[in-house]
Structures are given as C-alpha cells and as structure tokens.
Interface confidence: low
C-alpha cells in the first residue's frame, strides 16, 4: 500500500437546508482507471463511514441509492455533497481516496473538513 496526498477544505458550513459541499483533491501518482472515494465522519473519537463510491475515471461518480451523498468527478478532484444534515451531524468529515486499479494500490486520507450544521429555527404556523 502506497501513500498519496489528499487535500480538502478545513471548514464548511452546511446550508439552512442541511446540505454541505466540498472538494476532495488527490495527487494521483499514476494513471488510475478505478478510484474509490469514502467519506468518514469522526466525532467523539469514533469514526463511521458516511458513504462510498467506486468510479471509473472519466465516468460519473455514482453513490449507492441509499446514500446521503452525491458527487461528481473531474480529473483528480471529487466534488462531494452531503445532504440531510442536522445539528447533531456536526463533525469532522474525512475524505479517503483509494486508487483501486491498475496496481499498485494507493491510499490517501485527508485531514478532514469540519462541517458545521445549524438547525433552522422552526417557522410559526401560518394561515397563508
């Protein structure tokens, strides 16, 4: 397993609708044809997988149907969007990139993006 540099923004603020977007960029040492991107959430020293996608270079990045993530890829950049976030989801979101094929296998883990989520104030009932 060879190391690879992964860059991502330090801080992102989710929108009032609970959507956060950030770019995960990796320094590809070779011409990978298959890449796997995983988003991990670290909170209270516990790391959990948020979502993952495997994609072929030049093709659309497709997360699984059950995923709260969507994304697009462009060269060595992956534009990630996480939706349905609530205040309790605030935490450090780490981008992990694996160059799956062809060999050799490369692994890169970013320093993480701190995503802050603020729940919107509830609107009072209205007749309109």
């Amino acid at each position: 397993c060879k190391a690879m540099h992964v860059a991502q923004p330090a801080v992102v603020l989710a929108s009032s609708r609970g959507i956060a977007s950030f770019v995960c960029e990796y320094a590809s040492p070779g011409k990978a044809t298959e890449v796997r991107v995983t988003v991990l959430r670290q909170a209270d020293s516990q790391v959990t997988e948020v979502c993952a996608a495997t994609y072929m270079m030049g093709n659309e990045l497709t997360f699984l149907d059950d995923s709260i993530c969507t994304g697009t890829s462009s060269g060595n950049q992956v534009n990630l969007t996480i939706q349905g976030l609530r205040a309790m989801d605030t935490g450090l979101y780490i981008c992990k990139v694996e160059l799956m094929y062809p060999p050799p296998y490369y692994l890169g883990i970013g320093n993480g993006t701190q995503i802050y989520v603020i729940d919107p104030e509830p609107c009072p009932d209205s007749d309109f």
């Epitope: 995983t38 993952a52 072929m56 093709n59 659309e60 699984l64 149907d65 059950d66 995923s67 709260i68």
Partner: antibody
C-alpha cells in the same frame, strides 16, 4: 413486463472460463445498472459486482476482482458475466438482478439463474 | 466491508405464531432490505428501505430498525411464509447479504 432471461447451465473443468448472459426486456436497458449475485448450493447470497450499461463502468466485489468481467451489448439489451480460472468452489447458481433508483426498488427483478458446475 | 449477521439461523414455528427475524450490521447502515427465497427459486425482494413492503407482500409482514439492528416481523404465520429470508445492505460497497434465516414449520 420486466424480464431477465439467463443462459443455460454450464459444466466446466477447473481452470476454465465461463461466460453467461442475461437478456433484459420490458424496460430501457441503459436506465438501470445490472448486478450479478451468486449462490452455492445450500449457501447464502454473494454479490459479485455491477455494471452501468450506459457508461459501461463497473464496480466489483474485491473477492472477484481480476477474475470476473462484466460487459454489456446495448444493441441486444444483454448483460454478460465472464468468470475465469474456475475452481470447484465456484459451483453455484449465478443470478443477474436489476438495480433500482430513487423511484424503483432495487433488486426487484431477478433472472432465473444460470447453474455453473465446476468439476474435473 | 459491512458484515451482516442474521439470527437465529433456523426458526421453527407453527402457523399462526409470530416470527421475529433479526439482522445485525457490523457498522451502521442507512437502510436494511429483505429477500424471501424458496428452494430452487430466485430470491424475491420482500421488504426494502427497512420498512416498505414490496409489491404483493402481505400486510402481516413488517420491517423496522435503524443503525446496526434491524428486524423483520411476521405477525401471524401462514403456511406460504415458510422460507429462507436474507437481509441486505446497500449503504457501501461491496453490497453484502446476511447468511439467511430459515423459517421452518415446527
């Protein structure tokens, strides 16, 4: 009516390869990924991988990477799976099954299965 | 990969009884999906997105759970319900299935 019709049973020797087909009808072939799942006799279900018929991009279970190849022929709405370097423990029924999307349930449609027997 | 563990492996009950099948994931999943399979047949989607019954599935079936623990419940067993049930996760690749729970007539 959505239908997935798979090719017939195969008997192969260890070390050989097998290529099976899955012909889709009743929907737009390129709108849904096709997955492949296998089941050894009396055992559970094991996901092999899937293919996007439109882009032909694939995702594989690492267990089968390098041995399984998924392809499609869009003109005939047919998906194929080739498995190489067959071993006796590859003896199983191989199913194709259709992915869903946000509006259609995943794996709601399955082929009837292709029995592959690996024996010397 | 996410490992799904189903319990019990075999459940022996009589028609009319209540059945509870469990599926535990090695890490949190968004939804759990369930398939029914009878001998010599392809699996059938039975419950998807944790609690949605697939087309044609009787209302005596229900699904629940979140995080790592999920349950398929049959409120009152009918003879046609005796089969093997598999749980499946699609939260991350590789997609994985549980080893199955065989529901047999006591």
């Amino acid at each position: 009516e959505v239908q997935l019709v798979q090719s017939g049973a195969e008997l192969k020797k260890p070390g050989a390869s097998v290529k099976m087909s899955c012909k889709a009808s009743g929907y737009t072939f390129t709108d849904y990924n096709m997955d492949w799942v296998r089941q050894a006799h009396g055992k559970g279900l094991e996901w092999i991988g899937n293919i996007n018929p439109n882009s032909e991009s694939t995702s594989y279970n690492q267990k089968f990477k390098g041995r399984a190849t998924l392809t499609v022929d869009k003109s005939s709405s047919t998906a194929y799976m080739e498995l190489r370097s067959l071993r006796s423990d590859d003896t199983a029924v191989y199913y194709c099954t259709r992915d869903g999307n946000r509006y259609d349930a995943w794996f709601a449609y399955w082929g009837q299965g292709t029995l592959v027997t690996v024996s010397s | 990969e996410i490992v799904l563990t189903q319990s019990p492996a075999t459940l022996s009950l009589s028609p009319g009884e209540r059945a509870t099948l469990s599926c535990s994931a090695s890490s949190s999943v968004t939804y759990m999906h369930w398939f029914q399979q009878k001998p010599g047949k392809a699996p059938k989607l039975w419950i998807y997105s944790t609690s949605i019954l697939a087309s044609g599935v009787p209302a005596r079936f229900s699904g629940s759970g979140s995080g790592t623990d999920y349950t398929l419940t049959i409120s009152r067993l009918e003879p046609e319900d005796f089969a093997t049930y598999y749980c499946q996760q699609r939260t991350s690749y590789p997609l994985t299935f549980g080893q199955g729970t065989k529901l047999e007539i006591k």
